[in-house]
Interface confidence: low
């Protein structure tokens, strides 16, 4: 089948990194600078993606593969193939229509992107709060008081918070 196809279509012999140049009797010509073809048999080369402005180059374009971009400091990627860069906030904040807002009490965000999420409710799993939560960090749940029989653990649990997962700020 491949042989038949190549007899019918000379362009099928052109490898990745080249294009089938109709202007030159269907000779396989190398992709020009700043272009690529990732598969064989292509009649044109695609223009390389340019990582400009807030986009920066993660992988340079080659004759057989497109450039890959990520975002400069202060931004993070969104969308397939980092099609957009969205502004960062700080840990303990989320991006809202009024700028970067601190996480509300009882919520946290340990990244520079995304939204604030509620602290884990340790009591739902029958556990106690081992380390209180902050705007930047979730609570750490420890074993339930019943699990802490004398000698079973060297960790002394803190006094339970008034509301599970909450810490004074």
């Amino acid at each position: 089948f491949e042989r038949t196809r190549s007899l019918q279509d000379p362009c099928s012999n052109c490898p990745a990194g080249t294009f089938c140049d109709n202007n030159r009797n269907q000779i396989c010509s190398p992709c020009p600078p700043n272009s690529f073809s990732s598969a064989g048999g292509q009649r044109t080369c695609d223009i390389c993606r340019q990582c400009k402005g807030v986009f920066r180059t993660r992988k340079e374009c080659s004759s057989t593969s497109n450039a890959e971009c990520d975002c400069t400091p202060g931004f993070h990627c969104l969308g397939a193939g980092c099609s957009m860069c969205e502004q960062d906030c700080k840990q303990g904040q989320e991006l809202t229509k009024k700028g970067c807002k601190d996480c509300c009490f009882g919520t946290f965000n340990d990244q520079k992107r995304g939204i604030c999420r509620p602290w884990t409710n340790c009591s739902l799993d029958g556990k106690s709060v081992l380390v209180n939560g902050t705007k930047e960090r979730d609570v750490v749940c420890g074993p339930s008081p019943a699990d802490l029989s004398p000698g079973a653990s060297s960790v002394t649990p803190p006094a339970p918070a008034r509301e599970p997962g909450h810490s004074p700020q």
């Epitope: 400009k52 807030v54 202060g74 931004f75 957009m84 860069c85 502004q87 960062d88 904040q93």
Partner: antibody, heavy 112, light 110 residues
């Protein structure tokens, strides 16, 4: 927000403009500098984000530097020319939702 | 370089009437919607009216309406008041996160 530092300067001199933020934290907002020549439109210079990273318009790269401290954002302009004569505005906000709060502006006049 | 072209300028209006200001971009704005509208009066800083192409900024009357996507955007001001006499600017964000202002459209009253 309020801008300060605008004055009459000679060509080739440098000047630093300061934007003072009150009533909000610069750790929560991006800040931008924009200028407006007499009788002309608004021209974007650049911004600084919550982490201190900066971005500039292609024409302003090199001669303009934006930096910030806890409550102030500075715009340093070097090698001033008469074309830099303008009112310089400082704005609060971000790219996503636009700039929602502006200072009254400070006038820079470049003349020999 | 990206260019935002505003038409018409100036625009002459009547109190109680409606004006439409167009803003055409030389290429699609970021996410097809990262476009804001600002109002500026002489001797004053800009005031944000619309963001994300059609979202009304807080404190702005609903007489101001933004629409459009990609490269074509419109600001419509209805039930015009004398206080609306000003210059209006569109401003777009692009995929390289550059920010560009349009040339401005002056709204004056007959």
């Amino acid at each position: 927000v309020e801008e300060s530092g605008g004055r009459l300067v000679k060509p080739d001199e440098s000047l630093t403009l300061t934007c003072t933020a009150s009533g909000f934290s610069l750790s929560h907002y991006w800040m931008t500098w924009v200028r407006q020549a007499p009788g002309k439109g608004l021209e974007y210079i650049g911004f600084i984000n919550v982490g201190g990273d900066t971005s500039y318009a292609s024409w302003s790269k090199g001669r303009f530097t934006i930096s910030k401290a806890s409550t102030t954002v500075d715009l340093k302009i070097s090698s001033l020319t008469t074309e830099d004569t303008a009112t310089y505005f400082c704005g609060r906000g971000g790219l996503t939702f636009g700039w929602d709060l502006w200072g009254p502006g400070t006038l820079v006049t470049v003349s020999s | 370089a990206q260019v935002l072209t505003q038409t018409p300028s100036p625009v002459s209006a009547a109190v109680g009437g409606t004006v439409t200001i167009n803003c055409q971009s030389s290429q699609s704005v970021y996410s097809n919607s990262f476009l804001s509208w600002y109002q500026q009066k002489p001797g004053q800083p800009p005031k944000r009216l619309i963001y994300s192409a059609s979202d009304l900024a807080s404190g702005v009357p609903s007489r101001f309406k933004g629409s459009g996507s990609g490269t074509q955007f419109t600001l419509t001001i209805s039930d015009l008041e004398c206080d609306d006499a000003a210059t209006y600017y569109c401003a777009g964000v692009y995929s390289d996160n550059t920010y560009v202002f349009g040339g401005g459209t002056e709204v004056e009253f007959k």
